[in-house]
């Protein structure tokens, strides 16, 4: 199995290889095969990554930061294979590194420029701070600097505050988008460009229901097709905003298709669940069960964000027994 | 901790003779060519000789050809460089590297004979003058 790392060539025996902070890679080298075969793999040119002579490794000057984390394809080098397996890149390893063959014919350079990303899934918050709604988007770890968008509506809105805070490897970012009173619907992209990757939070508001008290209320929970895939894992949740706190309902895993139910009153429809429809019911409600119901169905690739607000009233028996 | 530590540079009239000495430790010496070069003020350093350790082939620039002989003594990881009927263009700061063998010094490929890439380790300098 091949570790995730594209290539792009350019001129001049020059590649670039753009890999995952903490995963492995393969920076490509390749020569006209010969015998006596000598390699070397230098960083920056001055630190010693890999030396092969003599049939064997020679690792004895190895720069200490490449200890136990390099090797190559030995069975592949008599084919004419010099790449280097590299394992847990980093992004103090980002750099050129170059690849010094020898065979007993020639001696030739290739050098490889390689890039580091970082892209933890981000997340799509809905937070209520006094009688202000927030949606905030939030990245924990990041690199490079991402390209942070919001759009109202399907338009693109130009208000993007961006809270950043650096640290050696990357940067965790939100960005709070003030949404008090709005019905609108929201969506904030969030795109590493070295990595081609791309997250999508998407938050809609549901018109208010209005229920009596022991009746049941239902509430739709289905998936953007734009978005959503089936094949990919995802997890849905639904939540109750309780002064100003969410407290979970229920989940499901696609994964295991396990169904994790907090509310005894609570009640998914199974059927439903296999197309893709996480809309949820609520029996025998009470007065306590006024407020916001929170679907969040997330992937690594998107958050989908439903809004509910359900208002339960008395009803009549109980107005006329107070 | 690698070192290479170049020495008997010093002042000598024009036709005399010097022996230059690189006395190398902290790496495996066996697996290491040597090469000789030099920088006078104002121009690029040049390689002038080599040595390969797995061949024992020894390499010179045209310009030092029949006067300089480069030899090794792999028991007291030492090159030197004998240089005879010296000339003032000879003058410079004289340096000793090693690179990798197969690399550095290479019999067939002459272009990257003295490629200072191909050179891990450098000694700081010796000064060669010669006066006429």
């Known amino acids: 199995i091949f570790p995730l790392a594209f290539f792009i060539y350019v001129p001049m025996n020059e590649q670039i290889v753009i890999g995952r902070l903490d995963e492995d890679i393969i920076l490509p080298s390749s020569f006209e095969r010969g015998s006596e075969v000598v390699i070397h793999w230098k960083y920056q040119d001055s630190y010693k990554v890999h030396s092969y002579y003599k049939g064997s490794d020679h690792l004895e000057s190895q720069d200490p930061r490449y200890a136990n984390r390099t090797s190559l394809f030995y069975n592949e080098i008599q084919n004419g294979n010099a790449s280097l397996f590299f394992r847990r890149v980093s992004l103090l390893d980002e750099g050129i590194y170059t690849c010094y063959v020898g065979t007993a014919i020639q001696v030739i350079t290739n050098k490889v420029v390689l890039k580091v990303g970082v892209f933890l899934t981000p997340v799509m918050k809905y937070e209520k701070r006094n009688t202000n709604s927030f949606l905030i988007c939030s990245v924990l770890s990041v690199y490079p600097r991402p390209i942070i968008t919001w759009k109202m509506d399907n338009t693109p809105i130009s208000e993007n505050n961006m809270e950043e805070t650096g640290s050696l490897d990357s940067f965790s970012i939100n960005s709070p988008l003030n949404i008090t009173g709005s019905n609108s619907s929201y969506e904030c992209t969030i795109e590493n460009s070295l990595l081609k990757q791309t997250w999508t939070g998407r938050w809609t508001m549901k018109d208010g229901l209005h229920k009596m008290q022991s009746e049941h209320v239902s509430l739709s929970c289905q998936p953007v097709n734009d978005y959503f895939s089936p094949n990919q894992d995802f997890k849905v949740t639904w939540s109750r905003m309780k002064s100003g706190t969410f407290s979970v309902l229920a989940y499901y895993l696609s994964s295991s298709q396990n169904t994790i139910i907090n509310e005894s009153r609570f009640s998914w429809n199974k059927e439903l669940i296999n197309q893709s429809d996480f809309s949820m019911n609520l029996m025998d409600l009470n007065l306590s069960d006024s407020g916001e119901y929170l679907c969040n169905i997330s992937s690594d690739e998107y958050t989908l964000l439903t809004i509910h607000t359900v208002h339960v009233e008395p009803s009549q028996e109980t107005a006329s027994h107070n | 901790d690698v070192q290479l530590q170049e020495s008997g540079g010093g002042l000598v009239q024009a036709g005399g003779s010097l022996r230059l000495s690189c006395a190398a430790s902290?790496?495996?010496?066996?697996?290491?060519?040597i090469g000789w070069f030099r920088q006078a003020p104002g121009k690029a350093r040049e390689g002038i000789s080599c040595i390969s350790s797995t061949h024992g082939t020894t390499y010179y620039t045209d310009s030092v050809k029949d006067r300089f002989t480069i030899t090794r003594d792999n028991a007291k990881n030492t090159v030197y460089l004998q240089m005879n009927n010296l000339k003032p263009e000879d003058a410079a700061v004289y340096y000793c590297a090693a690179g990798l063998d197969g690399l550095a010094c290479h019999r067939r490929d002459s272009g990257s004979r003295y490629r200072t890439q191909l050179y891990d380790y450098w000694g700081q300098g010796t000064q060669v003058t010669v006066s006429s």
């Open positions: 902290g790496f495996p010496f066996d697996d290491y060519s």
